[in-house]
C-alpha cells in the first residue's frame, strides 16, 4: 500500500493549481472541484447526493484548508445542477456544476482551467496530473494541504477486462494506472489535467484505492460539452 | 476542531445486545474512514473494523465477524458499533477514531448478569 | 494475519535517556502507526506512515523502519512520556496492533 499523499503522491506545489477547488459541506472539505469559469465549478454530481440538508460551498485560492492565506475564499453556493442522467447506483455522468453567489475574484491563485471540447479519448501513456484533498493512506488520513500525483492514461480496453472493471468504463469515461499511485476517497470531482487541458474528473463511485487491477476512473469532460455549455450559458 | 462524541456507558446483560454512538464534529465522515477499536480491561488495543461512510462498505478483523456491525449516518455525521450476542468476554472500553487520527473518549461496555 | 511482537513489553529510563521501543512483523510490511495510551484516556496518534509526526506530537519522538522491523525512538525521555506504546500496521488486513510496551519513568 500507498505511503503518500493522494495515495502515493506528494504535496503540490502551494497555488500552482489555481483551478483547484474544494467543495465543502457544513464547512468541512467533501470533495474536489475545478474551477471551468469565472462563477462555475465542475465537481462529482455524486459528492452532494445526501447534502440537502448541508450548507454547500466552494473554497477557492487554497493550498492548505486549515490556515488563512490571503488568497483563499469561501463562496456560497447559488445553483448546483447534477447531470440529469447522473443515479446514485452508477458511475456514469456523475458531473456536477455548481454556480457560485457571485463571479470568482481571479488573480494567480484562482484562474479557471481551460476544457477539453475535442471527444477524442487521451492517448495511453499519457501522464496526467490529479489533485485533491482526498485521503492519503488507508487509514482514512486526510491531508491539511493540497496533494497531487502524475499517472499515466490507461487504455479503456485493459481497464475494461474482467479482472478490472469489467465492462464498466464506457466511451465517456476513461481510466488511469492506480498502482500504489491513485486518486482516492475525497479526490472525487476533482481535475485529472493532461497537457494543461482538462480532460476528466474523478468519479465518485466506490471504488478500492492503490490497487493496480481496479484503476481510476474519471469522466471524460470532452464528452459532455454539450451539457456544459448548455449550463454555463 | 476535529471532535469525536461517544454514548455514554453501558451495563447490559448477557446475550443482549447494544449499539453504541459515534458523533463528529469539525469534519465529514464521508471524506474519510471511521474505525472502532476494543481495548479489554488491563489490556491491548484490538481493531474491529471499519466503515466508509461514503458508501457503507465496511471490513471487519476476522475474530469480530458476526459479533460486530459497524454502520454509519452521514446526515447526522454519526458512526456506530452494535454488539450481539454478549458474553462477559465483550466487556471492554470501545472506541471510535477517524483515520485512527483522532479518538472518541471510549464507552464502557459492562456485560454481567 | 500478520502478527506484531513489541519489546520489550515494559521497561523504565531516566529523565533525558535515549528509548528505543521496537515492533517486529511476522512478514513484511509497508508501513506503521504508532500510539501512546496513558491510564484512563483514549490512545493518542504519534507517528503515521512509519515516519510523519503526528500534529502536536513533540519533536523528540521519531519512528524509522522497513520490511519487518520498526521502531519509536524517544531522543530524551521526559516524565510526560510514562505511557504505553503500541504499533499498528497499515499494510495487510486485518490491521493489527502489537502488544504495546509499558514505558516508566525512573
Known amino acids: 500500500p500507498p505511503r503518500g499523499r493522494i495515495l502515493g503522491g506528494r504535496e503540490a506545489e502551494a497555488h500552482a493549481r489555481p483551478y483547484m477547488a474544494s467543495v465543502q459541506l457544513n464547512g468541512a472539505h467533501l470533495c474536489g472541484g475545478v474551477l471551468v469559469a469565472e462563477q462555475w465549478v465542475l465537481s462529482a454530481a455524486h459528492c452532494l447526493e445526501d447534502a440537502a440538508d448541508g450548507k454547500v460551498q466552494v473554497l477557492l485560492g487554497a493550498h492548505s484548508l486549515s490556515q488563512p492565506e490571503p488568497s483563499k475564499r469561501l463562496y456560497d453556493v447559488l445553483r448546483a445542477v447534477p447531470h440529469p442522467d447522473s443515479q446514485p447506483d452508477t458511475i456514469d455522468h456523475d458531473l456536477l456544476l455548481l454556480q457560485l453567489s457571485e463571479k470568482a475574484t481571479l488573480g494567480p491563485a484562482v484562474r479557471p482551467l481551460p476544457w477539453q471540447r475535442v471527444d477524442r479519448d487521451v492517448a495511453p501513456g499519457t501522464l496526467c496530473d490529479v489533485a485533491g484533498w482526498g485521503i492519503v493512506n488507508h487509514a482514512g488520513r486526510r491531508p491539511d494541504s493540497l496533494q497531487h500525483v502524475l499517472l499515466p492514461v490507461l487504455d479503456r480496453a485493459t481497464c475494461n477486462r474482467r479482472t478490472h472493471h469489467d465492462g464498466a468504463i464506457t466511451e465517456r469515461l476513461m481510466c488511469a494506472e492506480s498502482n500504489r499511485r491513485d486518486s482516492c476517497k475525497g479526490d472525487s470531482g476533482g481535475p485529472l489535467v493532461c497537457g494543461g487541458v482538462l480532460e476528466g474528473v474523478v468519479t465518485s463511485g466506490s471504488r478500492v484505492c492503490g490497487n493496480r487491477k481496479k484503476p481510476g476512473i474519471y469522466t471524460r469532460v470532452a464528452s459532455y460539452a454539450a451539457w456544459i455549455d448548455s449550463v454555463l450559458a | 476542531e476535529v471532535q469525536l462524541q461517544q454514548s455514554g456507558a453501558d451495563l447490559v446483560k448477557p446475550g443482549a445486545s447494544v449499539k453504541l454512538s459515534c458523533t463528529a464534529s469539525g469534519f465529514n465522515i464521508k471524506a474519510t474512514y471511521m474505525h472502532w477499536v476494543r481495548q479489554r480491561p488491563e489490556k491491548g488495543l484490538e481493531w474491529i473494523g471499519r466503515i466508509d461512510p461514503a458508501n457503507g462498505h465496511t471490513i471487519y478483523d476476522p475474530q469480530f465477524q458476526g459479533k460486530a456491525t459497524i454502520t454509519s449516518d452521514t446526515s447526522s455525521n454519526t458512526a456506530y458499533l452494535q454488539l450481539n450476542s454478549l458474553t462477559s468476554e465483550d466487556t471492554a472500553v470501545y472506541y471510535c477514531?477517524?483515520?485512527?487520527?483522532?479518538w472518541g473518549q471510549g464507552t464502557s461496555v459492562t456485560v454481567s448478569s | 494475519q500478520i502478527v506484531l511482537t513489541q519489546s520489550p513489553a515494559i521497561m523504565s529510563a531516566s529523565p533525558g535517556e535515549k528509548v528505543t521501543l521496537t515492533c517486529s512483523a511476522t512478514s513484511s510490511v509497508s508501513y506503521m502507526y504508532w500510539y501512546q495510551q496513558k491510564p484512563g484516556s483514549s490512545p493518542r496518534l504519534l507517528i503515521y506512515?512509519?515516519?510523519n509526526l503526528a500534529s502536536g506530537v513533540p519533536v523528540r519522538f521519531s519512528g524509522s523502519g522497513s520490511g519487518t522491523s520498526y521502531s519509536l525512538t524517544i531522543s530524551r525521555m521526559e516524565a510526560e512520556d510514562d505511557a504505553t506504546y503500541y504499533c499498528q500496521q497499515w499494510s495487510n488486513y486485518p490491521f493489527t496492533f502489537g502488544g504495546g510496551t509499558k514505558l516508566e519513568i525512573k
Open positions: 477514531a477517524e483515520a485512527m487520527d483522532y
Open positions: 506512515d512509519t515516519s
